[in-house]
Interface confidence: medium
């Protein structure tokens, strides 16, 4: 089990680092988006795990962004960001669609309402229960 957990961590960390870089290979990214969406978490250890991902980096004050699957829907009243950015992406996650391209990558500023903690603990708990 410890070996499985280490392997899982390695896969997840690689998925995060390579997020969005290859539009032809999005299965791992979509799976991880789904994990974040379902477990209400963001990143592996912390949301900051996403900050090194080049494709999510903007300029200046927009340098910190995370995938929309990190977004805490229950914590916002901002209907604009919900309707225009978040909900279309999460509806795809909800239906487990497999039709995303790099141009569609949905990212929100880190100062948005995003989940407070990483997914490691939740996934490890799931592994132990299965």
């Amino acid at each position: 089990r410890a070996q499985l957990e280490r392997s899982l961590r390695d896969v997840v960390e690689k998925t995060i680092q390579k997020y969005g870089t290859n539009p032809e290979e999005t299965a791992a990214e979509e799976s991880w988006d789904y994990v974040q969406f379902q477990l209400r978490c963001c990143g592996w250890h912390y949301p900051q795990d996403w900050f090194q991902v080049l494709i999510l980096r903007g300029n200046g004050s927009e340098a910190h962004r995370v995938p929309c699957s990190c977004y805490n829907l229950s914590a916002t009243n901002d209907s604009t960001i919900l309707d225009k950015v978040i909900l279309p992406q999460l509806s795809r996650l909800g239906h487990l669609a497999r039709s995303r391209h790099s141009a569609d990558i949905c990212a929100v500023p880190a100062e948005s309402h995003i989940y407070r903690e990483g997914c490691a603990q939740g996934l490890q708990k799931w592994l132990h229960n299965n």
Epitope: R40, E111, H113
Partner: antibody
């Protein structure tokens, strides 16, 4: 009404142990990150520990190894187990809710419970 | 670490008061301000650097992002004489304290 009530403070000798409790009402501990913060007499606020909704924990570097944060979801109660206590651990200890979204602040706070470490 | 200044501030009713908080790294806007009165628990004033907590008077204003943050009280009231703390909510990993050292606002 959302409320936190601490208990378990008191006088303890150096090297001794104490377990603080924080009873929550009006919300569920299991869906929130919860913190312990302390304040030595006449000093500022000092963060001690956090337990996330998932059960993962973090500690201030000085608290690692001596202090343990935990919770009992069935009792909706947060705990802080303090071992190998020293005189410098004398303080009022507060529990506070943080929520589940990154950037949530501590609100509400309990009234605090005084821990005195002295021989 | 969070560096708060000044540690003590003497002011009169009606004064405009400014307290600053500096983070040792970029904390985006994950900063809160608290007010504490003697013998009482801290009370949340501002979260996410500039969002006023429920029931807090509009004379309190938070600003800043990244590493530099400011709490401004536009017109000091008798009830505002207290100690104010900033706190970063960016990370709890491998740190000594998430709070600044505090600023005591006292009567001049």
């Amino acid at each position: 009404e959302v409320q936190l009530v601490e208990s378990g403070g008191g006088l303890v000798q150096p090297g001794g142990s104490l377990r603080l409790s924080c009873a929550a009402s009006g919300f569920s501990l299991s869906y929130n990150a919860m913190n312990w913060v302390r304040q030595a007499p006449g000093k500022g606020l000092e963060w001690v520990s956090i337990i996330f909704a998932s059960g993962r924990t973090d500690y201030a570097s000085w608290a690692k190894g001596r202090f343990t944060i935990s919770r009992d979801n069935s009792k909706n109660t947060l705990y802080l187990q303090m071992n190998s206590l020293r005189a410098e651990d004398t303080a009022v200890y507060y529990c506070a809710r943080e929520g589940s979204t990154w950037g949530d602040a501590l609100d509400p706070w309990g009234q605090g419970t005084l821990v005195t470490v002295s021989s | 670490d969070m560096t708060q200044s000044p540690s003590t501030l003497s002011a009169s009713v009606g004064d405009r008061v400014t307290i600053t908080c500096q983070a040792s790294q970029n904390i985006i806007d994950y900063l809160a301000w608290y007010q504490q009165k003697p013998g009482k628990a801290p009370k949340l004033l501002i979260h996410k650097a500039s969002t006023l907590a429920s029931g807090v008077p509009s004379r309190f204003k938070g600003s800043g992002s990244g590493t530099e943050f400011t709490l401004t009280i536009s017109s000091l009231q008798p009830d505002d004489f207290a100690t104010y703390y900033c706190q970063q909510g960016y990370s709890n990993s491998n740190i000594d304290n998430t709070f600044g050292g505090g600023t005591k606002v006292e009567i001049k």
